[in-house]
C-alpha cells in the first residue's frame, strides 16, 4: 500500500549521511517505472534539503543531524509519477518525529533569586520560588523534567538545614524555627536544577534569603539607674536623657522606643518623649518642681517599642532619682490681687490697709515693700510692715485716675536673698462715695425773649452717687427771684427757669442755689441773655430797620 507509518528519528544522529530512513513504494511499479519525490518543509521548502528521496528506489534519506528543539516534527508529502510524469498515486503524508536526546542542561531564569521571610517563623512558611527551564522534552521523556535541590547553605547557623525546596515546583520554604535576624540576617543558598528528574545534568544558581525583623527583642535601659538635678520651678527643663539598646532593626517600629513613667510622678510634674534620631528618652519637667514641698522625686520609667512584641518579653525599667535644687523664689503677695474698701477723702496719714507678701523659701528672709505704681500719688507704703496709708486726697470723682470707683495701685515686695527677688501685688481700692459734690445745672448760659418767654429747662448733675444725688431742690438768691422763678420737676432731676417780669434786652446774672438729697448745696450763676422778641429764640435779633 502507498502508506508509511510515522517515522521516529533521534535528534543529533551521528550518521553517516545521507542516512536511509524508510522506503516509499507504490505497488504500481509492477506495471510501469515509478519515480519518487518528496515535498514540504525540510524537503523542497525551508529548511530545504534536510530530507531527500532516491528517485528510483524510493528510499527516504536524512542528509544531516536533526535538532528537536528547533523542529520536533516534519510533515512531508511523497509523490509517485510514471515516466511520462503522470501521477500514479495520491500524495502520501509522511510524518517524521524527531525524538529527544538530553542535549540541554537546565537553565535558571536568574543567576540570583531574592526572597525574604520573617524571623522566628515555623516550618512550612514559604519564602520564594525559583525557576529553571530545560529545552529538552518533558512530556515523553524525563530529559526536560527538572528536579530542584538545595546544594548548600551559608552560613550554616544554627544548622545547615534551615530551608528546603519543593523538588518539582522550586518553592523554597522554612524547615526550622531557628531563624534569628539578630544572629543571621541573610542566608545564601546554592540551588541546583537537575534534569532527568534529578538524575541528569545539573546547573546551579544562588537564592538569597533576607531574614526580616520581628519585634522579638525588648529595648533595654543602659544604664538602668540615673541621678539628675533640676532647679525648682523650671518648666520644660530637660532632666535626663535615658539610653536604651534594642537588637531589632534600627529605625524600624520594632526598634523605636516608647517611654512611659510608671511611678513616682504623683503630681504629674514630668513628661518623657523619644528622640527621633538617638531613640533616647528625654525626660523633662511638665510643671515646675517645688523644693520646699518635695526636694527629691524617684521616677520609674518603662520602655517598650512602637511595634507590639511578637512574644511575651520582660520590659526594662529605669530608676531616675531627681534632686530638686533650691532657688531663691520671689515673694508672693497674698492674695495676688487685694480689694480694699476705703472712703474717699480720708485724712492724710489715715491707714488704708496692710498688704503683705509671703516668701516660698524656707529661710526666714526679710521682705521689704514699696509702691511701684500709684498714678495719683495718693498713697504711701511702710517698707517693713506693708502698711498702706493715705498721703493725698482720695477722690472717687477723679475721672483721670479712678475707673468704676476703683483706684488701682501696684506694690512690690523684695526679699534679701542673693540675688534678691521681687514679687508684685495689685491693690484695688474701692472708693466709697462721700457727699462732697453739690448739684450743678446745665447749661449755664441761656437766651430768652422778653415777650411771651419760653421756659428754660436745665439738667441737674451731681458727681456723687446715690443717695447723695436726686431729688434736688432749687432756690433763687440775691434778689433773682424778683424777675425769675425756679422749679424742680416731679422726677427731681431738672430745674425749670422762667422769666416772670419784663426785662429790657441785656445780659443778666441769675443766682441759682441747688441742693441734693443729702442737703449738699451748690450756688451757680446762670448767664441769661434777654432779647427783644416773642416766644422762642436762640440768639438775639439785630436792630429793626424800616423799609
Amino acid at each position: 500500500d502507498w502508506v508509511v507509518a510515522p517515522i521516529s528519528v533521534p535528534e543529533n544522529g551521528k550518521g553517516p549521511f545521507p542516512q536511509r530512513l524508510n522506503q516509499l513504494k507504490s505497488n504500481k511499479d509492477r506495471d510501469t517505472k515509478i519515480f519518487y519525490s518528496i515535498t514540504g518543509p525540510g524537503a523542497d521548502s525551508p529548511p530545504e534539503g534536510v530530507f531527500a528521496v532516491e528517485k528510483e528506489t524510493g528510499w527516504l534519506l536524512l542528509n544531516k543531524p536533526l535538532d528537536r528543539e528547533e523542529i520536533a516534527k516534519y510533515e512531508l508529502f511523497g509523490h509517485a509519477v510514471s515516466e511520462n510524469g503522470a501521477s500514479v498515486e495520491d500524495p502520501m503524508n509522511i510524518s517524521i518525529i524527531v525524538t529527544d536526546q538530553n542535549d540541554h542542561k537546565p537553565k535558571f531564569t536568574q543567576d540570583t533569586f531574592r526572597g525574604s521571610v520573617l524571623e522566628g517563623v515555623l516550618p512550612g512558611t514559604s519564602v520564594m520560588q525559583v525557576t529553571a527551564t530545560d529545552e529538552d522534552d518533558a512530556i515523553y521523556t524525563y530529559n526536560g523534567v527538572v528536579a530542584y535541590s538545595i546544594h548548600s547553605q551559608e552560613p550554616k547557623d544554627p544548622h545547615d538545614l534551615m530551608f528546603t525546596i519543593h523538588r518539582s515546583t522550586g518553592t523554597i520554604s522554612v524547615i526550622s524555627s531557628g531563624l534569628d535576624r539578630e544572629k543571621v540576617p541573610e542566608y545564601t543558598l546554592t540551588i541546583q536544577a537537575t534534569d532527568m528528574d534529578g538524575d541528569g545534568s545539573t546547573t546551579t544558581a544562588v537564592a538569597v534569603v533576607e531574614i526580616l525583623d520581628a519585634n522579638d527583642n525588648a529595648p533595654m535601659f543602659d544604664p538602668q539607674k540615673y541621678e539628675a538635678h533640676v532647679p525648682e520651678n523650671a518648666v520644660g527643663h530637660e532632666v535626663q536623657r535615658l539610653t536604651v539598646t534594642d537588637l531589632d532593626a534600627p529605625n524600624s517600629p520594632a526598634w523605636r522606643a516608647t517611654y512611659l513613667i510608671m511611678g513616682g510622678d504623683d503630681g504629674d510634674h514630668f513628661t518623657i518623649t523619644t528622640h527621633p534620631e538617638s531613640n533616647q528618652g528625654i525626660l523633662t519637667t511638665r510643671k515646675g518642681l517645688d523644693f520646699e514641698a518635695k526636694n527629691q522625686h524617684t521616677l520609674y520609667v518603662e520602655v517598650t517599642n512602637e511595634a507590639p512584641f511578637v512574644l511575651k518579653l520582660p520590659t526594662s525599667t529605669a530608676t531616675i532619682v531627681v534632686h530638686v535644687e533650691d532657688v531663691n523664689e520671689a515673694p508672693v503677695f497674698v492674695p495676688p490681687s487685694k480689694v480694699v474698701e476705703v472712703q474717699e477723702g480720708i485724712p492724710t496719714g489715715e491707714p488704708v490697709c496692710v498688704y503683705t507678701a509671703e516668701d516660698p523659701d524656707k529661710e526666714n528672709q526679710k521682705i521689704s515693700y514699696r509702691i511701684l505704681r500709684d498714678p495719683a500719688g495718693w498713697l504711701a507704703m511702710d517698707p517693713d510692715s506693708g502698711q498702706v496709708t493715705a498721703v493725698g486726697t482720695l477722690d472717687r470723682e477723679d475721672e483721670q485716675f479712678v475707673r468704676n470707683n476703683i483706684y488701682e495701685v501696684m506694690v512690690l515686695a523684695m526679699d534679701n536673698g542673693s540675688p534678691p527677688t521681687t514679687g508684685t501685688g495689685t491693690l484695688l481700692l474701692t472708693l466709697i462715695d462721700v457727699n462732697d459734690h453739690g448739684p450743678v445745672p446745665e447749661p449755664r448760659q441761656i437766651t430768652i425773649c422778653n415777650q411771651s418767654p419760653v421756659r428754660q429747662v436745665l439738667n441737674i448733675t451731681d458727681k456723687d452717687l446715690s443717695p447723695h444725688t436726686s431729688p434736688f431742690q432749687a432756690q433763687l438768691t440775691d434778689d433773682s427771684d424778683i424777675y425769675w422763678t425756679a422749679e424742680v420737676n416731679e422726677e427731681g432731676d431738672t430745674v425749670v427757669l422762667s422769666l416772670k417780669k419784663f426785662l429790657k434786652q441785656d445780659t443778666y446774672d441769675v443766682h441759682l442755689s441747688l441742693s441734693d438729697h443729702g442737703n449738699k448745696e451748690q450756688l451757680t450763676v446762670i448767664r441769661a441773655t434777654v432779647c427783644d422778641c416773642h416766644g422762642h429764640v436762640e440768639t438775639c435779633p439785630g436792630p429793626w430797620k424800616g423799609g
Epitope: V121, L122, G124, S126, R167, G178
Partner: antibody
Framework: EVQLLESGGGLVQPGGSLRLSCAAS????????MSWVRQAPGKGLEWVSA????????YYADSVKGRFTISRDNSKNTLYLQMNSLRAEDTAVYYC??????????WGQGTMVTVSS | QSALTQPASVSGSPGQSITISCTGT?????????VSWYQQHPGKAPKLILS???KRPSGVSNRFSGSKSGNTASLSISGLQAEDEADYYC???????????FGGGTKLTVL
Amino acid sequence: EVQLLESGGGLVQPGGSLRLSCAASGFTFSSYAMSWVRQAPGKGLEWVSAISGSGGSTYYADSVKGRFTISRDNSKNTLYLQMNSLRAEDTAVYYCAGLDRVWFDPWGQGTMVTVSS
Amino acid sequence: QSALTQPASVSGSPGQSITISCTGTSNDVGAYNYVSWYQQHPGKAPKLILSEVNKRPSGVSNRFSGSKSGNTASLSISGLQAEDEADYYCTSYRMDSTFMLFGGGTKLTVL
C-alpha cells in the same frame, strides 16, 4: 538528660476548659520549636499545634483552631496548651514534643484528657 | 482518613525482614526528603527512629533503615526481634501551616 513532663490533664465536661503544661529540662528550651500531638484511645497520632522558639509564630490543626491556644514561657522552660470549648472528640492522651526542624524529638510521657458529661 | 497511607498491620517472624510503606503525594513525600518514622510501644510515648528518610538518631539500631521512591517512603526492619513489636508512624513535611502530616500507623506483630 533531656526531659519533657506534661501535666494538667483530667476529666472535664463538654464546653469546659483545661490548661496543659509541659516542663522542659536538659536542653536549651528557647532554641526549640515545640508542639502538641494527641492520640485518641485506640487511634493514631494527630498533630495539634506548634509554636516557634521565640513564641512569635503559632500553628493549629483545623480541628482545634479558635478553641486551643499554644503558648510558652521561656523564662520558666514551660510550654502550655489552653483548651477551651472542649468536645468529646478532644478526649486523648496529649503529648508535648520538641520540633527538631520537621521531626518530633524528644517526646513527653503524655497526659490524659477526658471530655465527658 | 490520614494524609499519609500506611498498611494497618504487618507481621514477621523473628530474624526475618519486613517493610512498612508510607504513601503520600507529589507535594509531601514526593517533594521533600523529610519523612520521619516513629515507634510507639503500647502505653508509651512515641520515639523517633528515622528522620530525613533514612537518618538514624544516636541509640537507634542499624536494623532500622529507610528509603523513598517517588511518592512512597518505606521503613525496613531487618533481623526482627520481639521488642520490635509496636506501632509505627510515618510523618512527612508539607509546605503549609499543617506542616506535619501523620500516617495512620502500622501495627507490627512479631510472630
